[in-house]
Amino acid sequence: NEGSVTGSCYCGKRISSDSPPSVQFMNRLRKHLRAYHRCLYYTRFQLLSWSVCGGNKDPWVQELMSCLDLKECGHAYSGIVAHQKHLLPTSPPISQASEGASSDIHTPAQMLLSTLQSTQRPTLPVGSLSSDKELTRPNETTIHTAGHSLAAGPEAGENQKQPEKNAGPTARTSAT
């Protein structure tokens, strides 16, 4: 159904191979990514309320697919920390993040509630709640497949257990 307006391969925005997304746009994609669909010549990325497509061979497309596969994007994505308290001189931010069972959070409202209720993470990454408006959009459609929603995913229940220690001094957050 490639090209179909109603099918999983409909594109809201097509990114040309000649002009890959900027770093800022990639960060936005990482943060809001909910799913991807492999189409014939391109991949469609489903975000909270819109979609974007790119050529299957484009490096940024491969990177985003890998990111979602490894659960490093989307719901679980915490974003780069710009400013954070409790920093040790040579250590990265105290993450306090922990992962729990994959609770099947079916609605954006529940996702927001889950995030707000998480008192285990006093040092939230900057911008981690910047998508509140998107999370509660009334026109957001949650597509259910095999008992899971796009709003949830592997380890969607993270940050709901006890706090954890973060990595030691060798895990650096400086820009590469």
Partner: antibody, heavy 118, light 113 residues
């Protein structure tokens, strides 16, 4: 060729410390989610710890049995992961495997043996 | 935590036999975000580290003979060895990587009949 080489294992007394290292090559280390898994002699496999990638602030997660005693870290510039193990107990005796989870599969090292005994 | 139940715990078979090992998870391992099942199968021989055979439930790892195949979705998975070879006698584990903590099946020891 993907390679994960663990080192740092050995014999240590209860209450002692060890630091395991995992040197990686053959794949993009910075994009991999790293884990440690252990296996006591004749037993099954037990997950120990996980560390996420830089975009997720290198967040770490631990099995309940090691929480507060073990610390997982990574240095992407050196393609190396570390497991600092403190307050070791006899039940921590096992072969420790470093694993790299990538979209192309889960790679394992050959392991390093940790023996905690008095 | 997701529980992984593997069966049988051991089996005896002969070279050339078709062997089937099953693994059941306590919750679905299928992620709607990419339609992938977060399940892997390993082979382990005494004194060696686990060797990845199958990931994403059905994708054969590079270099693994095609007599090994994985199938299933959601909560029920199967590893099939179509024609058992002498070098296949080992212990096999399933593993879910859908959620932290990663959890493993108890293992299936494939022995020579």
């Amino acid at each position: 060729e993907v390679q994960l080489v663990e080192s740092g294992g050995g014999l240590v007394q209860p209450g002692g410390s060890l630091k395991l290292s995992c040197a990686a090559s053959g794949f993009t280390f910075s994009n991999a989610v790293m884990n440690w898994v252990r296996q006591a002699s004749g037993k099954g496999l037990e997950w120990v710890a996980r560390i996420r990638t830089k975009p997720n602030n290198y967040a770490t997660f631990y099995a309940d049995s090691v929480k507060g005693r073990f610390t997982f870290s990574r240095d992407d510039s050196k393609n190396t992961a570390y497991l600092q193990m403190n307050s070791l107990k006899t039940e921590d005796t096992a072969m420790y495997y470093c694993t790299a989870w990538t979209t192309e599969g889960i790679y394992w090292g050959q392991g390093t043996l940790v023996t905690v005994s008095s | 935590d997701i529980q992984m139940t593997q069966s049988p715990s051991s089996l005896s078979a002969s070279v050339g036999d078709r062997v089937t090992i099953t693994c059941k998870s306590s919750q679905s391992l299928l992620y709607s975000g990419n339609q992938k099942n977060y399940l892997a199968w390993y082979q382990q021989k005494p004194g060696q580290s686990p060797k990845l055979l199958i990931y994403w439930a059905s994708t054969r790892q590079s270099g693994v003979p095609d007599r090994f195949s994985g199938s299933g979705s959601g909560t029920d998975f199967t590893l099939t060895i179509s024609s058992l070879q002498a070098e296949d006698f080992a212990t096999y584990y399933c593993q879910q990587y859908y959620d932290t903590p990663w959890t493993f099946g108890g293992g299936t020891k494939v022995e020579i009949k």
